[in-house]
Interface confidence: low
């Protein structure tokens, strides 16, 4: 039975050209970690393996930093960059948990991020 | 165990400047982030920047191009070069730091005061 839930920074905007982090977290399950995928839409990201560490897709190398923790940091942002993001945990034994988040990217400094992850 | 002390903190003037230093124990600094985090009275605690060993930086919309947050990874120490400094950058200052692996950012220092006031 899968009790995890999985909190994220939800709808976020942010200005052309600067820096966001995308973050969620699973919380209320003792299942392990065993791999965080990112996605974009359809294109993978970034895999966080629990025992390999980080791999970032070829196409985002120059614009995607790991972390902070199991979130993605992506930089250099263009207004190509607003969509849909996606954070998969794989997890033992629950099985697969989806987390969701809206990047709008801005082209003029009305950015605003729409929601804080909540720091325990 | 994981420590982290910060130091660095004090009373400044509009317009002044500080440096905030946080001293890591416990883990070597590498596939990790540190950052500074902050708390004003009645406010959700904020990241404010973050770096990682290979040098990835972070910065919230607020400090850029005020703030510059650095580390020596020999020295296993994060910094935080603050200029320009505004009174609402008053709160207390926390280091933090992300094994990478397991809750985000789950290793906190005791928070250093920035008061900026005239």
């Known amino acids: 039975m899968m009790t995890g839930t999985i909190e994220t920074t939800g709808n976020i905007s942010a200005e052309k050209g600067g820096s966001i982090i995308l973050q969620c977290h699973l919380s209320s399950t003792t299942a392990q970690v065993t791999q965080v995928n990112w996605e974009q839409q359809d294109q993978l990201l970034a895999i966080c393996n629990a025992d390999l560490g980080w791999h970032i897709s070829p196409s985002f190398k120059d614009r995607v930093a790991p972390g902070p923790g199991l979130g993605l940091t992506l930089q250099s942002l263009t207004v190509n960059d607003t969509g849909e993001y996606f954070c998969i945990y794989h997890t033992y034994p629950d099985g697969t948990y989806t987390g969701r988040i809206f990047l709008e990217v801005l082209e003029s400094s009305v950015a605003e991020h729409g929601a804080r992850f909540q720091i325990p | 165990e994981v420590q982290l002390v910060e130091s660095g903190g004090g009373l400044v003037q509009p317009g002044g400047s500080l440096r905030l230093s946080c001293a890591a124990s416990?883990?070597?600094?590498?596939?990790?982030?540190m950052g500074w985090f902050r708390q004003a009275p009645g406010k959700e605690r904020e990241l404010v920047a973050a770096?990682?060993?290979?040098?990835?930086?972070y910065y919230a919309d607020s400090v850029k191009g005020r703030f510059t947050i650095s580390a020596d990874n020999s020295k296993n120490t994060a910094y935080l070069q603050m200029n320009s400094l505004k009174p609402e950058d008053t709160a207390v200052y926390y280091c933090?730091?992300?094994?990478?692996?397991?809750?985000?950012?789950?290793?906190w220092g005791q928070g250093t005061l920035v008061t900026v006031s005239s």
């Open positions: 770096i990682t060993s290979g040098g990835s930086t």
């Open positions: 416990g883990f070597t600094f590498d596939r990790s982030w």
């Open positions: 933090a730091a992300d094994v990478w692996y397991g809750s985000t950012w789950r290793n």
